[in-house]
Amino acid sequence: VVSHFNDCPDSHTQFCFHGTCRFLVQEDKPACVCHSGYVGARCEHADLLA
C-alpha cells in the first residue's frame, strides 16, 4: 500500500509532543516524525540511546 503524507489537520497540531505531525491520507491517521533525540508513537519519550 502506497501512503501519501501531508500536513496533519489543524485539529492535530499538538498531536506530536516532540516532532512533526504527518497525515497518512489513505489510512486517515496521523503519524509523527520525531525530532532528533525523541522516540515513541507521538515522540513522547526521550531516546536514552541517542
Epitope: D10, H12, F23, K29
Partner: antibody, heavy 117, light 107 residues
C-alpha cells in the same frame, strides 16, 4: 466488512433522556478508529455529536457538551449515546459512524427519534 | 466553528448531464473536505475524501476538486441511481461540520 446498526426508542418525551445503541460487526471497536454519533435534522442539517475512540477517550461537540455522554461495552462490541434534557429540537435521524482523523467512511442506516409529548 | 455553505439546496438535471455541486468553508480547511451521498432511504456513503480522492467502490463519474475555502463535487454523466442529497464536510478542525446539503433531482 464493518457494519454498524443503531437501535433505540423512536419516540421520547421532552425533558427526558435519549439512549441509543450502536452495534458494530466485522471490526472490534477496541482495535482502532473513532466511533461517532452524527444526527440529521429535518431540513437536512447534519451535526457531528461526538465520538469514543478505540482506547475509550471521548470528544464531544461543544454545543452538546453539557448534555451528551458516549460510552461503550467492549464485550458486546457496542457503543452508546446518552443525550439528556431533550427538547423538540432534538428530533432527528441519529447515525453511528466509524471515523478516522478527518472523515466518516462507514455509517449505520440511521434511526429516527421524535421528541414529542 | 467552521461554517460550511452549500449555496444550492436543490438542483434539477437530466440523465447524462454533467453536474457540479459547490461547497464553501468560512476559513481555509487545507483540503480536508469530504463528500457524502444520502439516498432517499437514508443510507449515507462517503464518496470523495481529502478533496479529490475516491473512496473504495465509488464510480469514476464522481470527482472532486478545490482548495482553500472553495470546493466542488462533479458527477460527469448523471445516472438515475445518483438521485440523492449530497453533503460536504470539513475534517480540518473540531467540531467537524457539514454543509446544508444539495438535493439532486431528475428533470
Amino acid at each position: 466488512d464493518v457494519q454498524l446498526q443503531e437501535s433505540g426508542p423512536g419516540l421520547v418525551k421532552p425533558s427526558q433522556s435519549l439512549s441509543l445503541t450502536c452495534t458494530v460487526t466485522g471490526y472490534s471497536i477496541t482495535s482502532d478508529y473513532a466511533w461517532n454519533w452524527i444526527r440529521l435534522f429535518p431540513g437536512n442539517k447534519l451535526e457531528w455529536m461526538g465520538f469514543i475512540n478505540y482506547s475509550g477517550n471521548t470528544s464531544y461537540n461543544p454545543s452538546l457538551k453539557s448534555r451528551i455522554s458516549i460510552t461503550r461495552d467492549t464485550s458486546k462490541n457496542q457503543f452508546f449515546l446518552k443525550l439528556n434534557s431533550l427538547t423538540t429540537d432534538d428530533t432527528a435521524t441519529y447515525y453511528c459512524a466509524r471515523g478516522g482523523l478527518s472523515r466518516f467512511p462507514y455509517w449505520g442506516q440511521g434511526t429516527l427519534v421524535t421528541v414529542s409529548a | 466553528d467552521i461554517q460550511m455553505t452549500q449555496t444550492t439546496s436543490s438542483l434539477s438535471a437530466s440523465l447524462g448531464d454533467r453536474v457540479t455541486i459547490s461547497c464553501r468553508s468560512s476559513q481555509d480547511i487545507r483540503n480536508y473536505l469530504n463528500w457524502y451521498q444520502q439516498k432517499p432511504d437514508g443510507t449515507v456513503k462517503l464518496l470523495i475524501y481529502y478533496t479529490s480522492r475516491s473512496h473504495s467502490g465509488v464510480p469514476s463519474r464522481f470527482s472532486g476538486s478545490g482548495s482553500g475555502t472553495d470546493y466542488s463535487l462533479t458527477i460527469s454523466n448523471l445516472e438515475q441511481e445518483d438521485i440523492a442529497t449530497y453533503f460536504c464536510q470539513q475534517g480540518n478542525m473540531f467540531p467537524f461540520t457539514f454543509g446544508g446539503g444539495t438535493k439532486l433531482e431528475i428533470k
